[in-house]
């Protein structure tokens, strides 16, 4: 079972691409988290 | 759940447009990018470039640009993929995905593909 | 030469394990780069499995069994898919894609046949 915290993750664009090591995450919540995260609830589990 | 929506199968001529459309339903388009990705029939993807939707910035792979468009319009969580004056090996399933990662997980999401025919 | 090479087809029993290679061309440093693996069945659209770097830089598809894995050969320049348990339903393609030059390159793609 994954542990996904929804405070404590940060976010990457999976599409912009990344200029070799430079890997940026984001900490503000994806827009569509929210509907997304629970959709799978075999693979990940939302820690309040 | 976040679903990306494609509009339907389209047949064209040689020398005009195609216009796909990417609506994102149970959930907005969001501010990750939308990639369009295309495949030819017994081929492998290739990525024809991306868009913002929140800025409506774009990328586009050198091979498409000048005949590629991206725009999205954010009123109706939708993006569009238009391909001008076609050929026949541009003869293709037509896909948007957009998607993003934590340090553990990657959630990517696709449409269902829309296949461009072009035939005189 | 192209940026990512893969070999055409493997077949391999239920079981077993399977490692798919992607190989990059010269010049090209496996270490330097990200390397993606998709899963394609007929009809479908492309899955995404994992990304692998190395072992403190990789990440899972949600929802993509713990028996799918990256790693890397370094002596090779190649990014290797490892699937573990070989099932029925890993039939498939599989492609790898890298970020490179400011664009999305894919791997021409394996076809994984599960004998028997």
């Known amino acids: 079972m994954e542990d996904f915290n929804m405070e404590s993750d940060s976010f990457e664009d999976f599409w912009k691409g990344e200029d070799l090591s430079n890997y940026s995450y984001s900490s503000t919540l994806p827009p569509f988290l929210l509907d997304a995260a629970p959709c799978e609830p075999e693979s990940l589990e939302i820690n309040k | 759940q976040v679903q990306l929506v494609q509009s339907g199968a389209e047949v064209k001529k040689p020398g005009s447009s195609v216009k796909v459309s990417c609506k994102a339903s149970?959930?907005?388009?969001?501010?990750?990018?939308i990639s369009w990705v295309r495949q030819a029939p017994g081929q492998g993807p290739e990525w024809m470039g991306w868009i913002n939707p929140n800025s409506g910035g774009t990328n586009y792979a050198q091979k498409f640009q000048g005949r590629v468009t991206m725009t999205r319009d954010t009123s109706i969580s939708t993006a569009y993929m238009e391909l001008s004056r076609l050929r026949p090996d541009d003869t293709a399933v037509y896909y948007c995905a957009s998607g993003f990662c934590t340090r553990t997980i990657c959630f990517v999401y696709w449409g269902q593909g829309t296949l461009v025919t072009v035939s005189s | 030469q192209a940026v990512l090479t893969q070999p055409s087809s493997l077949s391999a029993s239920p079981g077993a394990s399977v490692s798919l290679t992607c190989t990059l061309r010269s010049g090209i440093n496996v270490g330097a780069y990200r390397i993606y693996w998709y899963q394609q069945k007929p009809g479908s659209p492309p899955q995404f499995l994992l990304r692998?770097?190395?072992?403190?830089?990789?990440?899972?598809g949600s929802g993509v069994p713990s028996r799918f894995s990256g790693s890397r050969d370094a002596s090779a320049n190649a990014g290797i898919l490892l699937i573990s348990g070989l099932r029925s339903e890993d039939e498939a393609d599989y492609y790898c894609?890298?970020?490179?030059?400011?664009?999305?390159?894919f791997g021409g793609g394996t076809q994984l046949t599960v004998l028997g």
């Open positions: 149970g959930g907005t388009l969001s501010s990750y990018a």
């Open positions: 894609a890298i970020w490179h030059s400011s664009a999305w390159v």
């Open positions: 692998y770097k190395s072992d403190s830089d990789k990440q899972q």
